[in-house]
Structure formats: structure tokens, C-alpha cells
């Protein structure tokens, strides 16, 4: 029950996270005009990964797409790539995890297959979340660098009557959406990985009792149960015989001098 809950919660959290990553990628407010300590303008500038926008005080908003690919900064291209990779991985992860959900029965899918798929989707969510966090962080770093560069420029070259105003940009809403969404996807992925451990069937090895009747002395070899939860392991129960400690899978039982009295 706890496994199902963990898996279900992981799926929902990841779903919300990926929706957030998609929203952040599409949003125009990755960077917004810094209003602090700046002359108050009747125009507000903000930029996204795909277009830049200007909102006038009247409410009129005009957006222009970045219609060039080669003319864009490499960092912006990298951020775009990271976000898209995050979305693609997340979408595939969601698709895989739907089939992996314990509450959904598909044909005669074994628990081991579900465990496999749960782990796969979990890893995908983790990588997706990391891609989003990395993309947003790279963009934020770019903003911080440009902010201080433009601040330095604001206080230089102001000789003469004519002054130029450098538009400084600060963190936009999309960055916070991206960070939160990336974090949620990451958490969801970790939850899926945890759920996977509980989904994998237990591999129980029975050490059987072996009787050696050589003469009248009986050798009793007690053995405990060896339980392990492994991924993709042989799920057959293995009887381990003391005679050469070979499993019944490995060797056919040929009559030997010890088998019969």
C-alpha cells in the first residue's frame, strides 16, 4: 500500500513539475526590466527564451520573436536546449510511469517489469528536473553577469549633457517557476525510485536440509533463508543442496554413492 502511495505521489508530483517546466519554457518573463533605482519609464520590457516583449503603460503589449538562430547568444541556445531536453525526458518519463503504476493493470505485466519501468521513469524525472534547474540557473547567472556589467556602464561615459539609459534586467517570474518545477520533478523522480525498490519482488533462496547417510551418521547442514531484492534478478526459488553446493538449476541429479544407502 505504501509503495503504491509513494509511486502515485511521485507520479503526481512529477506531472506537476513537468507541467511547470513546460510553462516556464513558454513564459515570456524570464528576465524583466529592473525598476529599482532606475528612472521611471512608461514602458516595461521583459524577455523570454523565444521572444522579447514591451508593455506600454496604456496596456498595449508588443512581442517580437527571435527570428534568428545563429545570431542568438550561445548561452540562450544552451538554456533552450536544456529546457527542451528536460521536457522531452519528462514527457517520456510520464508515459513510461503511467504503465508502471501499480494501480493500473495492463495484461499480465509482471511486478518485475513494473519495477523496471518505475525506476526508468524515476531516473528520467531526475534528469529532467536537473536539466530544468540547470537551464534556469545558467540563465540566472547570465542575468547577474549582465546586470553588473550594465550597472558599471550606467556610471561611466556620462560626460556631457546627453545621457543614455541602459535597460537593466532582473529575474523574471519564469525563473522561479522553473526552479520550483525542476525541484518538483526531481522530488517526483526520487519518489519513483524509492517506490521501485518496494515493487521489486523478493528473491528468496531456501537452503534446504540435506541428509547424508554415510553409514549411520547423519550430517545435518542447517541453512537460513537468503532474501534479496535485486533488480532484474532470477526470481525462482533456488534449493541449495549441500552436495557440491550446486543448485538444481545448474546440475542434473545423477545418482551418486551418497544418495542411496
Amino acid at each position: 500500500m505504501a509503495v503504491t502511495a509513494c509511486q502515485g505521489l511521485g507520479f503526481v508530483v512529477s506531472l506537476i513539475g513537468i507541467a511547470g517546466i513546460i510553462a516556464a519554457t513558454c513564459m515570456d518573463q524570464w528576465s524583466t526590466q529592473d525598476l529599482y533605482n532606475n528612472p521611471v519609464t512608461a514602458v516595461f520590457n521583459y524577455q523570454g527564451l523565444w521572444r522579447s516583449c514591451v508593455r506600454e503603460s496604456s496596456g498595449f503589449t508588443e512581442c517580437r520573436g527571435y527570428f534568428t538562430l545563429l545570431g542568438l547568444p550561445a548561452m540562450l541556445q544552451a538554456v533552450r536546449a536544456l529546457m527542451i531536453v528536460g521536457i522531452v525526458l519528462g514527457a517520456i518519463g510520464l508515459l513510461v510511469s503511467i504503465f508502471a503504476l501499480k494501480c493500473i493493470r495492463i495484461g499480465s505485466m509482471e511486478d518485475s517489469a513494473k519495477a523496471n519501468m518505475t525506476l526508468t521513469s524515476g531516473i528520467m524525472f531526475i534528469v529532467s528536473g536537473l536539466c530544468a534547474i540547470a537551464g534556469v540557473s545558467v540563465f540566472a547567472n547570465m542575468l547577474v553577469t549582465n546586470f553588473w556589467m550594465s550597472t558599471a556602464n550606467m556610471y561611466t561615459g556620462m560626460g556631457g549633457m546627453v545621457q543614455t539609459v541602459q535597460t537593466r534586467y532582473t529575474f523574471g517570474a519564469a525563473l522561479f517557476v522553473g526552479w520550483v518545477a525542476g525541484g518538483l520533478t526531481l522530488i517526483g523522480g526520487v519518489m519513483m525510485c524509492i517506490a521501485c525498490r518496494g515493487l521489486a519482488p523478493e528473491e528468496t533462496n531456501y537452503k534446504a536440509v540435506s541428509y547424508h547417510a554415510s553409514g549411520h551418521s547423519v550430517a545435518y547442514k542447517p541453512g537460513g533463508f537468503k532474501a534479496s531484492t535485486g533488480f532484474g534478478s532470477n526470481t525462482k526459488n533456488k534449493k541449495i543442496y549441500d552436495g557440491g553446493a550446486r543448485t538444481e538449476d545448474e546440475v542434473q541429479s545423477y545418482p551418486s554413492k551418497h544418495d542411496y544407502v
Partner: antibody, heavy 118, light 113 residues
Framework: QVQLKESGPGLVAPSQSLSITCTVS????????VHWVRQPPGKGLEWLGV???????NYNSALMSRVSINKDNSKSQVFIKMNSLQADDTALYYC????????????WGQGTTLTVSS | DIVMTQSPSSLTVTAGEKVTMSCKSS????????????LTWYQQKPGQPPKLLIY???TGESGVPDRFTGSGSGTDFTLTISSVQAEDLAVYFC?????????FGGGTKLEIK
């Protein structure tokens, strides 16, 4: 069609306050902003302030302490209040609609004359 | 506050002539976000309120005759009347529409001989 009409007291004594009303028709105050501009006799234009569709305001920094602009959307009226009036506040007071593009002022009222005199 | 300086303060021309008047701002009115200059031109005929002629420095308001054209960028702007008509007798004001407070130039008075 778009129309703006100013109405004010006409004559005010020095150090007194005044309120001028701008009644608009042909557009909604929830969609467009309204600016106030004054013009002393034989002189140029001086921007006083603006109230935007959302209700936010901006004022001329030189007059900020004694000017306030507000509005009543349901009555389609905009008000400018000025206190501590002096003789140099004598002017023709205009209200004008904020253009949707370019931050210009696209429709103007005919103006109302204010004389500050004892 | 942004200072808007217009020149000349007045000029007299004959009908049919080409006229140019200048407007300078103390700071750039160019917005980097959309590469638009937030400068507006108005015409005020005697006894009338001002009328919007040009916004974004060069975009003519609808209904304004084609003979009125605006140009310039940054801090230097020009209003040109390609062929002055008698009805163009007016005072022309430029306005900073970028920084608050919005400020007007002193005006250029156009007189017809």
C-alpha cells in the same frame, strides 16, 4: 464618438484648493488612461499627471505634493485635486485620453480656465 | 526630469515651402526592447486644444496628412512639413513619452507669410 469635457470652479483664492472634473464619453475608463495637462496664458504645455485604466497614477514631480488624481469608472469621471494654489497656477486645464499606442494623448477636451486671484 | 528643447522657437514660411523643426531631449528616448523612440509631436492651432500628429517619433496618427513626417532617434528628432499649407499655422510641441514625468518642449510657432 470620443469626447472629454472639463468642468471647474473658474476662480479660486490663493492658498485654497480646487477640484476639476473630466467627464468622458465614447470610451471606458477601465480601458483607457486619462492625462491632465495645463497651459498658462501665452505659454507652453505642462504635464500634470495621469491615471491609468487599472487605477495607477503618475505625477509631475514638481507638483506631486499638492496634486492628486482619481476617478469614478461607473460615472466616467476623472478628478484632479490641487491644493495650496498660487497665482502661477492660473492656466487652461485640459484632460486628454491616453492613446493605446506610443504613450501619446490622442483626444483632448476643450479645457477649463482656472484663475487664482484674491 | 527630462528636458525637451525645441528650435527654432518660431519660423515664418510661405505656403508650399518645406519646413523642418527640431526637438532635442536630455536623455535618449529610444527603448532598447522594441527599438522605438518614445517621442510624440502635437499641433496646437490658435484657440484649440493640442492635436496628436506623430507618435513613436515617426508613426503618423490616423487622419493626419502625409505631408507631416517625423524622424530621428535617440535624442535628436525632427518634424518635417513637406509642403506647408495655410491651415498649418500653429504651434508644434514635442513630448517625451518615455520617462515620467512626461515633459513637453517649449514649442515652435509656425507662421505663414
Amino acid at each position: 464618438q470620443v469626447q472629454l469635457k472639463e468642468s471647474g470652479p473658474g476662480l479660486v483664492a490663493p492658498s485654497q484648493s480646487l477640484s476639476i472634473t473630466c467627464t468622458v464619453s465614447g470610451f471606458s475608463l477601465t480601458t483607457y488612461g486619462v492625462h491632465w495637462v495645463r497651459q498658462p496664458p501665452g505659454k507652453g504645455l505642462e504635464w500634470l499627471g495621469v491615471i491609468w485604466a487599472g487605477g495607477s497614477t503618475n505625477y509631475n514631480s514638481a507638483l506631486m505634493s499638492r496634486v492628486s488624481i482619481n476617478k469614478d469608472n461607473s460615472k466616467s469621471q476623472v478628478f484632479i485635486k490641487m491644493n495650496s494654489l498660487q497665482a502661477d497656477d492660473t492656466a487652461l486645464y485640459y484632460c486628454a485620453r491616453a492613446a493605446y499606442y506610443g504613450n501619446g494623448l490622442d483626444y483632448w477636451g476643450q479645457g477649463t480656465t482656472l484663475t487664482v486671484s484674491s | 526630469d527630462i528636458v525637451m528643447t525645441q528650435s527654432p522657437s518660431s519660423l515664418t514660411v510661405t505656403a508650399g515651402e518645406k519646413v523642418t523643426m527640431s526637438c532635442k531631449s536630455s536623455q535618449t528616448l529610444l527603448n532598447s526592447g522594441n527599438q522605438k523612440n518614445y517621442l510624440t509631436w502635437y499641433q496646437q492651432k490658435p484657440g484649440q486644444p493640442p492635436k496628436l500628429l506623430i507618435y513613436w517619433a515617426s508613426t503618423g496618427e490616423s487622419g493626419v496628412p502625409d505631408r507631416f513626417t517625423g524622424s530621428g532617434s535617440g535624442t535628436d528628432f525632427t518634424l518635417t512639413i513637406s509642403s506647408v499649407q495655410a491651415e498649418d499655422l500653429a504651434v508644434y510641441f514635442c513630448q517625451n513619452a518615455y520617462f515620467y514625468p512626461f515633459t513637453f518642449g517649449g514649442g515652435t510657432k509656425l507662421e505663414i507669410k
